[in-house]
């Protein structure tokens, strides 16, 4: 018995009930005062949360009962109150006090997982011991009562590529599994109280575990051999046709990148499509059928993220061979050169050759070429490109002629080409030197001798390498005239002088002066060219400027070769 | 070189199980998967599943899903086929082929074959 | 019934050139090689043709392997009494997720 040491007359025991039972009435214990000699003069009552309802007692001798099935994780503990009353006096014959009512357990509960669902995302080919995740029961027994939520944790389902630790719930790999093959595992596991002991309750949940890629397959060629066509006339960047390799990965393991081997010409590459992972052949530079009008190249695919302990795997990369077969194009005439400077002296009869241009058919079929010539009637063509005059050439008139020649192929005149000629016609020392301009020459009435009376210059319409060079000389056929004389100044000029003191304007009014001009030219032209002097009345001043307002008679000079 | 050798030919009634082996040798047993094939008398190939050697990852063909278990043993180099609840349709040889280092690479070399018979 | 449709015999005599087809569909052909194996009775088969054309060592060029769409086919020139085999033809199949055979061409060599 239990003595309560406040309340010094109260006597009770530890009051248990076990959970779950099924009679309509349990007898928990007694409730008695020390005073109570049983005869019946004291009244017991229950008071507090449970009292009448679940818990009732017997107000002569003070049992307690319980009269309802009591669930323990419901409800564990219950705290009552107890009084006992004298009968005859209706005092109080203790002090109220406060007891408990404690509900002993059962193995009532199965463990439960609380947290479903459980998913799993592990890489393939994980080693043994990897951790996967870890599942955990709760059981709502109570954990100081015997096992009673003991747990142990085992697998129902998964292997052997999984194991769980019996008392944490961990679940581990325990074989490497490969995504290629199976990628999502369901896996059981079972939660059992008591320690497994019998009388042990269970209870399972389900773990979907899915394996993630890790890139240990290559990419494939699914053909060892690709044949394509190509258009001579393709202009750069032209899909030639597509390529494929396959990979067993998936997302970015399996993206994949294509390369070109064995092509020193660089004429193809290689681009990816993106969404399909194809790899398209293009044209890097322009095919010419006539030239080679086949490649053999060799293509190689590897993924373009590849870990470094993953490298075993991918090497050797996987090739495929690529035959690229140009087709042949009609193709226009080609000229020998992009442009022809051709050279004529002038002064040729008609039907001199000027020079020659060639235009060929670069097709295998070698169409001889037909010809036409624009730009110029002074010209022609024929059959073999051969240039010839129609006129003679005068460089004075024209020294260069634009033409255009048009080759055309005599099997189809729809192929045609053109070429620009440029025909330069050079010198040849046709003319002689003449006086630059008209002179219109006086000399004073007055005039001294030795002074000087006209400065004279030429031209030569010749066109001339090095600098002209002219040459004067007074004509030796001019033996009459000794009134003046010409020195050669040697810079392309000469001066007239008077050779005498005084002229009558009346007895002798103009005087024509024969002059011969040379040039440097191979051979040299000479020219014989008259000076017309005429005399003037200059008066005290020796001034001529005012001789050509005297409405004198103007004679032209001449020129004779 | 490259070889794989079977067990012998076995013997069965309906409903028993029987188990296949098929040692391999001459190359990296991990790094290859192994296929198993069969052929019944007089007619063609049938393929059964495929294993990874490397862990043991399986792929069974729908027809012998829940009837078939394909095992390994890294430490022998060796493949186990094993087909449970025989019937007289499971006569036939079986073969084990080394396949490519994807799934879908031809089979280069392959087992001399396991005759089993179903017979009550 | 087999996945891929082969015919189940052909003849021809020694010297000639025969071929035999094998038709599938787009998940196995249309998208996989295409196999080819040789198997003389009692013995287990051996890989003729691989990835659709390519020969391994030791297989005379006699045999060549094409293949085109959803079709594939296997051409013996110059034929020898010693080509008198049955032939089947074998790609992986990615909706069934599997291998598919042929159901196999048994040729005779006449002669």
């Known amino acids: 018995d239990y003595k309560d040491d406040d309340d010094k007359g109260w006597v009770w025991n530890q009051f248990f009930v076990p959970e779950e039972m099924n009679t309509t009435s349990h007898h928990i214990g007694q409730l008695r005062s020390d005073l109570d000699n049983g005869n019946n003069s004291f009244q017991y009552k229950l008071l507090g949360a449970g009292a009448g309802s679940t818990f009732i007692i017997d107000e002569r001798t003070g049992d307690i009962y319980a009269i309802q099935k009591l669930d323990r994780e419901e409800r564990s503990l219950y705290i009552l109150r107890a009084q006992v009353i004298d009968i005859a006096t209706g005092r109080a014959v203790e002090p109220e006090s406060e007891f408990v009512i404690k509900v002993s357990d059962i193995n009532d509960n199965e463990p439960r997982f609380l947290d479903e669902p459980y998913e799993a995302i592990v890489p393939e080919m994980s080693p043994e011991g990897t951790f996967v995740i870890k599942v955990t029961a709760n059981d709502a027994d109570d954990p100081s009562t015997g096992y009673h939520a003991r747990i142990l944790y085992n697998l129902e389902r998964g292997q052997p590529y999984f194991s769980v630790e019996p008392t944490t719930g961990v679940i581990r790999i325990s074989s490497k599994m490969d995504r290629e093959l199976q990628d999502t595992y369901c896996v059981i596991i079972q939660a059992k109280d008591m320690l497994g002991q019998p009388g042990a309750l269970s209870g399972t949940t389900t773990v979907s575990i899915k394996l993630s890629d890790i890139n240990d397959n290559k990419p494939i060629f699914k053909e060892s051999f690709y044949r394509f066509t190509i258009s001579e006339s393709a202009p750069i960047g032209t899909s030639i046709g597509k390529i494929m390799a396959y990979d067993d990965d998936i997302g970015e393991n399996a993206e994949m990148e294509y390369s070109i081997e064995d092509d020193d010409s660089k004429i193809f590459d290689i681009i990816i499509d993106n969404d399909t992972q194809e790899g398209i052949v293009i044209l890097k530079k322009k095919v010419d059928f006539e030239q080679q009008s086949y490649y053999g190249i060799r293509a190689k695919v590897k993924n373009c993220h590849v870990d470094e302990e993953l490298a075993p795997a991918h090497v050797n990369a996987s090739t495929t061979y690529i035959k690229v077969q140009v087709e042949d194009e009609d193709e226009p005439p080609v000229f020998l050169l992009p442009y022809y400077i051709l050279e004529i002296p002038e002064g040729k009869p008609y039907g001199t050759i000027v020079g020659t241009v060639s235009a060929t058919d670069p097709d295998r079929r070698q169409s001889p070429m037909r010809y036409y010539l624009t730009g110029s009637k002074m010209f022609d063509i024929n059959d073999n490109g051969t240039i010839i005059t129609t006129n003679m050439l005068d460089r004075e008139v024209s020294a260069w002629y634009n033409l255009t020649v048009t080759a055309t192929e005599t099997y189809n005149v729809q192929q045609i080409s053109s070429a620009h000629v440029y025909v330069q016609v050079f010198n040849i020392n046709d003319n002689a030197p003449e006086f630059s301009q008209f002179y219109e020459t006086y000399v004073c009435e007055n005039a001294e001798s030795g002074e000087i009376v006209q400065i004279i210059s030429a031209i030569d319409r010749d066109e001339s390498i090095e600098d002209h060079h002219f040459y004067f000389n007074h004509s030796l056929e001019d033996t009459n005239n000794s009134s003046f004389m010409l020195t050669d100044n040697q810079d392309n000029t000469a001066v007239i002088l008077s050779n005498r003191t005084g002229f009558n304007l009346k007895e002798e009014p103009v005087f024509y002066m024969i002059i011969l001009i040379a040039d440097n030219g191979i051979p040299s032209l000479t020219s014989t060219n008259t000076l017309t002097i005429q005399v003037c009345d200059c008066g005290d001043s020796r001034n001529t400027e005012t001789c050509a307002n005297k409405g004198l008679l103007f004679i032209m000079g001449f020129r004779t070769e | 070189q490259v070889q794989l050798v079977q067990s012998g030919a076995e013997v069965k009634k309906p409903g028993a199980s029987v188990k296949v082996s098929c040692k391999a040798s001459g190359y990296t047993f991990t790094s290859y998967y192994i296929h198993w094939v069969r052929q019944a008398p007089g007619q063609g190939l049938e393929w059964m599943g495929i294993i990874n050697p490397s862990g043991g990852s399986t792929r069974y063909a729908q027809k012998f899903q829940g009837r078939v278990t394909m095992t390994r043993d890294t430490s022998t180099s060796t493949v186990f086929m094993e087909l449970s609840s025989l019937r007289s349709e499971d006569t036939a040889v079986y073969y084990c082929a080394r396949g490519g280092i994807q799934l879908w690479l031809h089979f280069d070399y392959w087992g001399q074959g396991t005759l089993v018979t179903v017979s009550s | 019934q087999s996945a891929l449709t082969q015919p189940p015999s052909a003849t021809g005599t020694p010297g000639q050139r025969v071929t035999i087809s094998c038709s599938g569909s787009?998940?196995?052909?249309?998208?996989?090689?295409v196999n080819w194996y040789k198997q003389l009775p009692g013995t287990a088969p051996k890989v003729l043709i691989y990835?659709?054309?390519q020969r391994p060592s030791g297989v005379p060029d006699r045999f060549s392997g094409s293949k085109s769409g959803t079709s594939a086919s296997l051409a013996i020139s110059g034929l020898q009494s010693e080509d008198e085999s049955d032939y089947y033809c074998a790609a992986w199949d990615d909706s069934l997720n599997g291998w598919v055979f042929g159901g196999g061409t048994k040729l005779t060599v006449l002669g």
């Open positions: 990835t659709n054309n």
């Open positions: 787009s998940s196995n052909i249309g998208r996989n090689f």
